[in-house]
Amino acid sequence: AITEAREEAKPYPLFPGPFPGSLQTDHTPLLSLPHASGYQPALMFSPTQPGRPHTGNVAIPQVTSVESKPLPPLAFKHTVGHIILSEHKGVKFNCSISVPNIYQDTTISWWKDGKELLGAHHAITQFYPDDEVTAIIASFSITSVQRSDNGSYICKMKINNEEIVSDPIYIEVQGLPHFTKQPESMNVTRNTAFNLTCQAVGPPEPVNIFWVQNSSRVNEQPEKSPSVLTVPGLTEMAVFSCEAHNDKGLTVSKGVQINIKAIPSPPTEVSIRNSTAHSILISWVPGFDGYSPFRNCSIQVKEADPLSNGSVMIFNTSALPHLYQIKQLQALANYSIGVSCMNEIGWSAVSPWILASTTEGAPSVAPLNVTVFLNESSDNVDIRWMKPPTKQQDGELVGYRISHVWQSAGISKELLEEVGQNGSRARISVQVHNATCTVRIAAVTRGGVGPFSDPVKIFIPAHGWVDYAPSSTPAPGNADPVLII
């Protein structure tokens, strides 16, 4: 707000006497008087004590009129230099100056610690113009001071492209000690020394620190802030705080818990997220970390079959994300699974063991020793094989799939046959004479179809040929066997 008292108010007792300083009589060069573009901050009525003229920062703008009339020097009047007050109290201070109207264009602003207080709602300027002089009082008020209001305040008047600066007004807000650094919670190794820091400031200074452990003072004599407490070591959890004292009273920091690092608790809630024939995806809930971050976890897997040799497979993984896919497992097998995690102190106990099973998979090998021969009398092709080893069946055999491809004079057709699980032979009708028949066999479980055997070829002659001999799966390294009868 800005208040202007018109001429009739004439409040000039506030500004007794002549302008500060003496008039300049020498003829100084004409100096341009550019416009002032500063902001005229807001103001309010607040009488100031008439002080002696301030001669320390007198501006004598180097300006003369067209008629060489000198401009008088200008200076802010002295005011209070240092204000000490308690936090949350109100304060009001001002600077005042009398400006001859011949200056014609000025702006006044408040600055704090070198920064302009723009648009400050608690700044008020009133001015009292008459025909020769305008008396200006710039007031600054703070309704409830805080520590952040501490600092050096000045008024600046911009006039004739020069600045006139008032004496600084130092505001010192006093209150209870204010913590700038408080002790922080820590997790420490048993019987290992550690430090805690506490720092508090006034004003007023000095600030003295007492340390408190589990409600008892640690130091008999206070230490000047800042204070570092060295604790030689703990065997059990403790709570520390610090007290900061100054002439205004006492402030107590937050209490911080110092924990002793220990081995973690075992994980809980190990659960199966997904099972396949050869892998199991598990998750777990980590136990209490023992005040030390988990580093990694170990998954222990053993076959649940009583006839197994009892060996344990161990899989190490990172502590996060509490999820692990156990691979290289046998199909249709039962396993016991446990999880243990470690921190810098050591390994947790193993979680409660859980049972998990892999599912059936497709067989991993093809039937062995496939042989094929022509039974011309019945116009059939007989096929024999041996079933894959039990361990590689990856489940319970439900049968076989036979692929037979007939090729003759550029024509090719494939047929598929399904055979029950008990057999190890099959008979298929001759589809085309004077043709090559290529046979492949795959074992089938509920988990899927396994790989097909290597192809066995047999030539089926035209009607009237009598001799025949079997064709069989080739020995390794031999290419497609073809027996022509």
């Epitope: 002032a36 005229q40 807001a42 009339k69 264009d105 113009p129």
Partner: antibody, heavy 120, light 107 residues
Framework: QVQLVQSGAEVKKPGASVKVSCKAS????????MNWVRQAPGQGLEWMGW????????TYADDFKGRVTFTLDTSTSTAYMELRSLRSDDMAVYYC?????????????WGQGTTVTVSS | DIQMTQSPSFLSASVGDRVTITCKAS??????VTWYQQKPGKAPKLLIY???TRHTGVPDRFSGSGSGTDFTLTISSLQPEDFATYYC?????????FGQGTKLEIK
């Protein structure tokens, strides 16, 4: 009482110059800055600049720099505004207006206005 | 430059009405805003300065308010002599700039 009296209406040709006077009375002329403001027909107010009546130092608005000159005759408490190279869009009422106080930039006293017509 | 935008440009009202004219600055001008009244063929007259202070001799039905960027001129009960054009002006910084004006007409 405080008043500002301006010179009479002017009719000028494009390219010519016009000089408007503003005579102050009822106060100390050199204590108050003098501003010049114009108003085209049916339009708003446009600030042209001001002159410090004590030092004679003028300040011109950017739109008028190079074409306008403010001068003073302190012996007769008169301010002058000269506008050169007149154009048709300079046709307006030109006002002088007193700057209110040393810390204020508004106008408490205005002249009656001078109409400038630019016509070929 | 700081732009001053007045609204409305035209306002029709009757004697006894309460009317409000607003002025918006393009940037913070604190409370360095003044209002003028201008009647046809006459020079503007100062009404309000420092956003809310009435000039000497201005009737108290005229009031101003606002700070920062938003300002209002209020006429609490229109009188026949109040029908005129009203201008706001900022003087926080040079160049001094005016609003485009609000013409108050009899309904």
């Amino acid at each position: 009482q405080v008043q500002l009296v301006q010179s009479g209406a002017e009719v000028k040709k494009p390219g010519a110059s016009v000089k408007v006077s503003c005579k102050a009375s009822g106060y100390t002329f050199t204590n108050y800055g003098m501003n010049w403001v114009r108003q085209a027909p049916g339009q708003g107010l446009e600030w042209m600049g001001w002159i410090n009546t004590y030092t004679g130092e003028p300040t011109y608005a950017d739109d008028f720099k190079g074409r306008v000159t403010f001068t003073l005759d302190t012996s007769t408490s008169t301010a002058y505004m000269e506008l050169r190279s007149l154009r048709s869009d300079d046709m307006a009422v030109y006002y002088c207006a007193r700057k209110s106080t040393v810390v204020s930039r508004y106008f408490d006293v205005w002249g009656q206005g001078t109409t400038v017509t630019v016509s070929s | 430059d700081i732009q001053m935008t007045q609204s409305p440009s035209f306002l029709s009202a009757s004697v006894g009405d309460r009317v409000t004219i607003t002025c918006k600055a393009s940037q913070d001008v604190g409370d360095a805003v003044t209002w003028y009244q201008q009647k046809p063929g006459k020079a503007p007259k100062l009404l309000i300065y420092w956003a809310s202070t009435r000039h000497t001799g201005v009737p108290d039905r005229f009031s101003g308010s606002g700070s920062g960027t938003d300002f209002t001129l209020t006429i609490s009960s229109l009188q026949p002599e109040d029908f005129a054009t009203y201008y706001c002006q900022q003087y926080r910084s040079y160049p001094l700039t005016f609003g485009q004006g609000t013409k108050l007409e009899i309904k």
